[in-house]
Amino acid sequence: KFSKQSWGLENEALIVRCPRQGKSSYIVDWYYSQTNKSIPTQERNRVFASGQLLKFLPAEVADSGIYTCIVRSPTFNRTGYANVTIYKKQPDCNVPDYLMYSTVSGSEKNSKIYCPTIDLYNWTAPLEWFKNCQALQGSRYKAHKSFLVIDNVMTDDAGDYTCKFIHNENGANYSVTATRSFTVKDEQGFSLFPVIRAPAHNETKEVEIGENTNLTCSACFGKGAQFLATVQWQLNGNKITDFSEPRIQQEEGQNQSFSNGLACVNTVLRIADVKEEDLLLRYDCLALNLHGLRRHTIRLSRK
């Protein structure tokens, strides 16, 4: 059946997303499968449902089991299963395989280690990072947003990396840790001055007032793994995060690799319920790497 494994440690927060994704307007009901008992939605409960999310604040070993989520649209009900296992904290430093998230590979040019599942939590930077249980210190390690960047990666940087952060729920703080292996691969590649594939410079996109629209900023940075390559949107020269308009959201950049080996990144700007004032803004697609910055501007016009 449509199920997903989730795991956590006792006395830490664990948030699980229903494997059955639906539109945000759809109702989601959660049940404990063994008893068919409904999970409460009141936040005063230690375990409660919040739309697509099931929250254990904090988790206990006894919470382990299969949870059913039913996502209800006006015409369809779709069921997903979350197989949750809560483990006791390990007394020693060793992180067992069953607590490990997927392994990531890096190279001299690209050493990003993303903190698994962090997007489900309400956390604030900076993250704490540990390698083989030792806190990472020194200028080679940079905690950036939800990932760790290691400068001048060497083979002995391989190992198990744990991120630790605090989830905040209604003023209460809960600790979360997640561990994944990092392997180092030797990769021949090169980087170029960024090339923006989309949008074209000074492009105009026709939009409907009241509709949703997406703008994609797509840029390539060379061949093989890239050490620093970011693609982002700016509004009137300001970062999206500094532009306090919840209707306008930027997705985290998605890496893309083409058959010709080019390393490219796509970042989507989502504009919900387009308004007249959005047509007055200048939308800048910025591509930045070690070689420099390239900018393409796009404007919106009424259809």
Epitope: G22, K23, S73, E211, T213, N214
Partner: antibody
């Protein structure tokens, strides 16, 4: 009541072009992904193309990639399929259909279908 | 792409009999599988979604089962209007693919 009505089919020579339309009513058109599916005479169903609700994301079957273009006009509640460089093997009844669930990057079933429009590619 | 193979190609049965149709996927589709019914000159009609859930308005005599790679559509007691072609479809990944169809005909 949900209704989908295709039009624009007909006889066309190999290498020619045709534009199919699908007029939608009875639902909030812009909230749904739309799909073209075809069925060659006496044969099974073949997915042709999908377009997301906002119109920005499209996907195509390999057999039509580079020749067909799916588009939509949400203000007119209309779905289109522009077919260029037509071949004999494109001969089929073309159905437009609605995906009632669709979330980013995922697909679902087709709950409403039009009655279909026949495209014949022949010299 | 995921290939769906339906069997048998044709099923010859009488009204009141039980019909069992099979659909096998070339790789796991979890339960992202649907069944459609198509009558001559008509568009397909959705019967079953997520392998085992009946769509709105579909009679209880239609049921679906299976998960992963092997799926079954069962019609518990055939009515005269059930004689048609049945297609399975996967939607776990693009391209969306359909089986080649099973024709249920009157014996």
């Amino acid at each position: 009541e949900v209704q989908l009505l295709e039009s624009g089919g007909g006889l066309v020579q190999p290498g020619g072009s045709l534009r199919l339309s699908c007029a939608a009513s009875g639902f909030t058109f812009s909230s749904y992904d739309m799909i073209w599916v075809r069925q060659a005479p006496g044969k099974g169903l073949e997915w042709v193309s999908t377009i997301r609700g906002e119109g920005g994301t499209t996907a195509y079957a390999d057999s039509v990639k580079g020749r067909f273009t799916i588009s939509r006009d949400n203000s007119k509640n209309t779905l289109y399929l522009q077919m260029n460089s037509l071949r004999a093997e494109d001969t089929a009844v073309y159905y437009c259909a609605r995906d009632p669930w669709s979330t980013e990057g995922s697909f679902f079933v087709l709950d409403y279908w039009g009655q279909g429009t026949l495209v014949t590619v022949s010299s | 792409e995921i290939v769906l193979t339906q069997s048998p190609a044709t099923l010859s049965l009488s009204p009141g009999e039980r019909a069992t149709l099979s659909c096998r996927a070339s790789q796991s589709v979890d339960d992202d599988l649907a069944w459609y019914q198509q009558k001559p000159g008509q568009a397909p009609r959705l019967l079953i979604y997520d392998a085992s859930n009946r769509a709105t308005g579909i009679p209880a005599r239609f049921s679906g089962s299976g998960s992963g790679t092997d799926f079954t559509l069962t019609i518990s007691s055939l009515e005269p209007e059930d004689f048609a072609v049945y297609y399975c479809q996967q939607y776990i990944t693009a391209p969306l693919t359909f089986g080649q169809g099973t024709k249920v005909e009157i014996k």
